[in-house]
Amino acid sequence: IVGGTNSSWGEWPWQVSLQVKLTAQRHLCGGSLIGHQWVLTAAHCFDGLPLQDVWRIYSGILNLSDITKDTPFSQIKEIIIHQNYKVSEGNHDIALIKLQAPLNYTEFQKPICLPSKGDTSTIYTNCWVTGWGFSKEKGEIQNILQKVNIPLVTNEECQKRYQDYKITQRMVCAGYKEGGKDACKGDSGGPLVCKHNGMWRLVGITSWGEGCARREQPGVYTKVAEYMDWILEKTQSSDGKAQMQSPA
């Protein structure tokens, strides 16, 4: 996160760290807890690393430097990458992770509510992006979970800034005209959440941007509302019944 500040314990209890253990262990992506056994993240996090057993998912943590060999983590039972995601295109950048064992909810580890299907009418004015990613383009993973308040921008405005790419209705953009605040490398897959009527909802999944926090280059996020049918289909067919946090 560029231009952010430290988060507090329990402030973003749905935020998880997706880490890979090969020879060393490192944080690669963020994710959002959406049910006892389900994490929503970005498909591109798994490019070149599709093997379930190399991944460790840490939930209920604030500081990555607190992780030791004794820190509990979740393992992956199944990675479900959207069927239309292609490494060569970058659309449909969304994936579900089914955990091997369900998580108990606590003050520091609980799910984020999902938006309604095709939610286009809600005007979100209080949106935040969180993650342990770089604090500048040539930076490093941060120890303490960072947060930053970023306004949504219209898809029309976003398309003007990214004429080389098609900004689809299944994407949502956020950023300041002058730059300075944004997600960055290592924040991929993490949440863009917005508070509406006193409730936090998962509006976007951190996907891509041109650099980080550059002027007139907003961050691009996978629009969760556009994938509600897919999320429900995959979680229900795997579970027998859904255990998602739907909006009230």
Partner: antibody
Amino acid sequence: EVQLLESGGGLVQPGGSLRLSCAASGFTFSHYLMTWVRQAPGKGLEWVSYISPSGGHTIYADSVKGRFTISRDNSKNTLYLQMNSLRAEDTAVYYCARVARGIAARSRTRYFDYWGQGTLVTVSS
Amino acid sequence: DIQMTQSPGTLSLSPGERATLSCRTSQFVNSNYLAWYQQTPGQAPRLLIYGASSRATGIPDRFSGTGYGTDFTLTISRLEPEDYGTYYCQQSSRTPWTFGQGTRVEIK
């Protein structure tokens, strides 16, 4: 399976014209930037031109600007390179390639993930 | 234009040895737009690495890429017989997109 098949190469005199084609299959052609790259005999690779998915945006190397025109027909899944005012230094194997634009570490990427087998253009009197 | 300079021009190594190929650029290149290709005689180039460090589909893990800014490296940890050929770096950060002149890896 992604396939790119170039055709239209051959021997042409200096000042002459040639039209290369690249037939694409195995992917949604209209979603991708496409590019031409050439390689003179015994030399390295030289980028020639690219075209946007819709065909509305084209860019050329200075060495071919004003003489070559890249175009595409998405209904036929075919990429073209119209080469006019050919010179001896245009002699090369011409490759068409698909330009992938995925996402890595929260940024877009750009690279040539599939290439055709090439077609040889010889400009000589 | 961004010039790409590869070194060495030729690398003579035995199977099993480590190959380190360098690519320097005349201006800053966003590493997401830096790729490496392999070409063997009579064949079209083949993508090895994209985004400076991501291996393309089907590329063995003995190939790795690193670098940032103006200095990029392709490493082949243990040369196999099929690895001999010419390697090119390429940037598509700014037009005109440009290739390095190539490094030829030959059998010692």
